[in-house]
Amino acid sequence: MSSKYPRSVRRCLPLWALTLEAALILLFYFFTHYDASLEDQKGLVASYQVGQDLTVMAAIGLGFLTSSFRRHSWSSVAFNLFMLALGVQWAILLDGFLSQFPSGKVVITLFSIRLATMSALSVLISVDAVLGKVNLAQLVVMVLVEVTALGNLRMVISNIFNTDYHMNMMHIYVFAAYFGLSVAWCLPKPLPEGTEDKDQTATIPSLSAMLGALFLWMFWPSFNSALLRSPIERKNAVFNTYYAVAVSVVTAISGSSLAHPQGKISKTYVHSAVLAGGVAVGTSCHLIPSPWLAMVLGLVAGLISVGGAKYLPGCCNRVLGIPHSSIMGYNFSLLGLLGEIIYIVLLVLDTVGAGNGMIGFQVLLSIGELSLAIVIALMSGLLTGLLLNLKIWKAPHEAKYFDDQVFWKFPHLAVGF
């Protein structure tokens, strides 16, 4: 017999989500208006295309990338969409309140939506570590806390360290990874006997996860270049990201084969390692002066990703209860750190090249920025984890982890689904 959504959650989720949606509508009604200045159509279309790329990355790319579980593929895709839709709404309001509110009303532009989509992407990266172990009501909490934490982090970094939009947002990799890992650490870990098969991957869902990886691979240059100010910066960012992800694909596939005793290629390694280069060059994608450097970074990132996928899952599964196929969290944490270190190296070179005695101070500022991102991620992640453990959310029982049947109505239940 199909397992039903627990009665209490059936009552609590619609009420909680719809009340929240009504509150958001009211906030939009009272505090926002559209940008009234007349922007020409060509400019609008170009600006919208960037936002569209980001939405495709979020909805299709990350949605399908997390859908490789044998019995949790529907939930992965749909819950991702739900979180994206909710996250974008809250991020638009929050960014507006934090940056424009003293002037009276929040002006919504296409750029606001672009920023909000990127903020919501953070949640989609983090949630990979907990998908299958939480219900939608809990995910709503996670969206609200993470988007709020990231928005505040960006504002603090912008005000204290005076960084631009791009540098500010590129902490997203490290932030999202550590947030997700700390939430996972708080959730019940052991899978009871008889449910181990559910967190295994299956061929068709793995194919859809590969489709997600392909979409992310195609649009990663748009993500890395979306917030840059000048055409030359965007051009360099697109080129360098493309070279880096191209090399990380080759590295991922060959490295995966190398890591296997029989030379076989692991789907899980490939899913995440193809993106490695894009994450590693993110912070400095517009600054890398020549293609070969971006390619070397892609190679190093691919190797780190495959190495991480081979040796870290055991530790992550034991300590954090993260299934073997959910490797985005620790992958992004390592690669995000690599990206930040590369930027610090560039900063040192810049300061040294200027014959400037203030290297230590500059490096200290950058490390401070990175540390702040990690600390806020860990603290807000732990807070979220503690909130998600509250009884009111009626979290799925451990026996119902990674199970679409808990959440979805299937017209017929085929054996073995």
Partner: antibody, heavy 125, light 106 residues
């Protein structure tokens, strides 16, 4: 030849409005960020506003935030500055300038490489 | 905040002139210099602390890093009598200009 030509200046009463235009020739506005910079009589240069090359971001000096709006029409290759609630402090020569970027090592260096001749705005009763 | 010294100076044709610009915090080499003649628009001279803009005579040079920068005119010409502004581009916006240094004929 790359050129910028401002127009629309004049005398306006306090609390009044004015729209300045800056026509660009020799390059496309859609591929360049643009600034407005002003200079009060006998004073130095003060940055007023910036619009990104794709029109996605507009930044303003604190002194004009909420009163001035920078915009552009790429089909006319023209930049605008809509000024509202003007006061005597806004009396100045207003210049438009092109935003240019060159890669440094740890960030880009931005500068204003092409300037218009300026248009004078006088706020007086 | 950007400060310039001196606020004005008098010099003769052929003199070597040095103008100093100080930033309130480390801006590495992200500094530009502009020249403005009376009644005219500003003109870019140097960007990135030391790179000469095309079309600018080689007698102009820029140096410095961190918080202290200098603009040097090796041999002052009659057309160089003007006001010179420095502008930081490390933390933008806002785009902060120095108060200017007026170079007058002695």
């Amino acid at each position: 030849q790359v050129k910028l030509l401002e127009s629309g200046g004049g005398v306006v009463q306090p609390g009044g409005s004015l729209r300045l235009s800056c026509e660009a020739s020799g390059f496309a506005l859609r591929s360049s960020g643009m600034h407005w910079v002003r200079q009060a009589p006998g004073k130095g240069l003060e940055w007023v506003a910036l619009i990104w090359f794709d029109g996605s971001i507009r930044s303003y000096a604190e002194s004009v935030k909420g009163r001035f709006t920078i915009s552009r029409d790429t089909s006319k290759n023209t930049l605008y500055l809509q000024m509202r609630s003007l006061s005597a402090d806004d009396t100045a020569v207003y210049y438009c300038a092109r935003d240019k970027a060159v890669r440094g090592i740890s960030r880009y260096n931005y500068y204003m490489d092409v300037w218009g001749k300026g248009t004078t705005v006088t706020v007086s009763s | 905040v950007m400060t310039q010294s001196p606020s004005s100076l008098s010099a003769s044709v052929g003199d070597r002139v040095t103008i100093t610009c100080r930033a309130s915090q480390n801006i590495i080499r992200y500094l530009n210099w502009y020249q403005q003649k009376p009644g005219k628009a500003p003109r870019l001279l140097i960007y990135g602390a030391s790179t000469l803009q095309s079309g600018v005579p080689s007698r102009f040079s820029g140096s410095g890093s961190g918080t202290d920068f200098t603009l040097t005119i090796s041999s002052l010409q009659p057309e160089d009598f003007a006001t010179y502004y420095c502008q930081q581009s490390y933390r933008t916006p806002p785009f902060t200009f120095g108060p200017g240094t007026k170079v007058e004929i002695k």
